[in-house]
């Protein structure tokens, strides 16, 4: 019941968190800031990873996306593919972890094929959530080391005077998103890789044999001392011994699955 | 690079009228707030008047009712309808605009044109 539970809620924990890594990602307030040398009107100004918009205080907004790919900053794109593939693998992995949960029977599909799928799904939440967790982190160094309060002033070759306006540049709400969200992802792709543990029957294959020696004269079969794992060739625990030695499967009438060392 | 080239600069007697016009080209993203400047020989640099990208407008009390701006977003084109010029509205008008580039539109610049000159004079 308890690893049904935690699967569960390791289920609900993700689909929030991947829905959180989609929103961040689409959202526009990666970055915010206000345009202070504006003698007119507050000019607001938010941006996304996928466009760039102006708000004034009279109303007026606009939006404009990003059309190029080659001329963008590198860290942009870089930002842009680790939330691509945090969505990515954590759609797979709820894909996945909907025919593992336990409370869904499929057919006739084993505990063992659950527990793969389980792992499996949780381990896809786990670097989905580390991915989205990355991507805001890198675009938040972004803004803290490249542009916090831009005041630097150049001057172009044409002779026109070239300043970067007196910006000041705070965390948009995606940022807060993206990391609550990759945070929800990586803990319910750990509590899917703890249930994963509950739902694998640990199954022995070791079977206990018992020797009887029948007096002195015990003759062993040349090259016959040979060791079953339960994994190999020797899985029906063959005679491997002539004399006294017999199996628990001879001895008794019905072997019980469940023959324990 | 971006370019801000100002035209319809010239001489001018008091009372006449003059359309100034700056065009911003090159790898722009986004133009925000455009303005005129101007100064004067021997005087510091003076604003006239701004324009937001929607269409807020801010002017000098010295050119209040006489000067009107107003701008292009689609060609990127700002505009000075200067009525009623006084011997006192000489000076070099320069333009500029607060953009962002296609290649960081993460960060907003104040580009400025070479300036234009007016000379109202009889």
């Known amino acids: 019941m308890a690893v049904t539970a935690c699967q569960g809620l390791g289920f609900v924990v993700s689909l929030i968190g991947i829905a959180g890594i989609i929103a961040a990602t689409c959202m526009d307030q990666w970055s915010t800031q206000d345009l202070y040398n504006n003698p007119v009107t507050a000019v607001f100004n938010y941006q996304g990873l996928w466009r760039s918009c102006v708000r004034e205080s009279s109303g007026f907004t606009e939006c404009r996306g990003y059309f190029t790919l080659l001329g963008l900053p590198a860290m942009l794109q870089a930002v842009r593919a680790l939330m691509i593939v945090g969505i990515v693998l954590g759609a797979i992995g709820l894909l996945v972890s909907i025919f593992a949960l336990k409370c869904i029977r499929i057919g006739s599909m084993e505990d063992s094929a659950k527990a793969n799928m389980t792992l499996t799904s949780g381990i896809m939440f786990i670097v989905s959530g580390l991915c989205a967790i990355a991507g805001v982190s890198v675009f938040a160094n972004m803004l803290v080391t490249n542009f916090w309060m831009s005041t630097a002033n150049m001057y172009t070759g044409m002779g026109g005077m070239v300043q970067t306006v007196q910006t000041r540049y705070t965390f948009g709400a995606a940022l807060f998103v993206g990391w609550v969200a990759g945070g929800l992802t990586l803990i319910g792709g750990v509590m899917m890789c703890i249930a994963c543990r509950g739902l694998a029957p640990e199954e022995t294959n070791y079977k206990a044999v018992s020797y009887h020696a029948s007096g002195h004269s015990v003759a062993y079969k040349p090259g016959g001392f040979k060791a079953s794992t339960g994994f190999g060739s020797n899985t029906k625990n063959k005679k491997i011994y002539d004399g006294g030695a017999r199996t628990e499967d001879e001895v008794q009438s019905y072997p019980s699955k469940h023959d324990y060392v | 690079q971006v370019q801000l080239v100002e035209s319809g600069g010239g001489l001018v007697q008091p009372g006449g009228s003059l359309r100034l016009s700056c065009a911003a080209s090159g790898s722009i993203f986004l133009i925000n707030a455009m303005g005129w400047y101007r100064q004067a020989p021997g005087k510091g640099l003076e604003l006239v008047a701004v324009i937001t990208r929607g269409g807020s407008a801010n002017y000098a009390d010295s050119v209040k009712g006489r000067f009107t701006i107003s701008r292009d977003n689609s060609k990127n084109t700002l505009y000075l309808q200067m009525n009623s010029l006084r011997a006192e509205d000489t000076a070099v008008y320069y333009c500029?605009?607060?953009?962002?580039?296609?290649?960081?539109?993460?960060?907003?610049?104040?580009?400025w044109g070479q300036g234009t000159l007016v000379t109202v004079s009889s």
């Open positions: 500029n605009a607060d953009l962002n580039l296609r290649s960081d539109p993460f960060k907003w610049y104040t580009f």
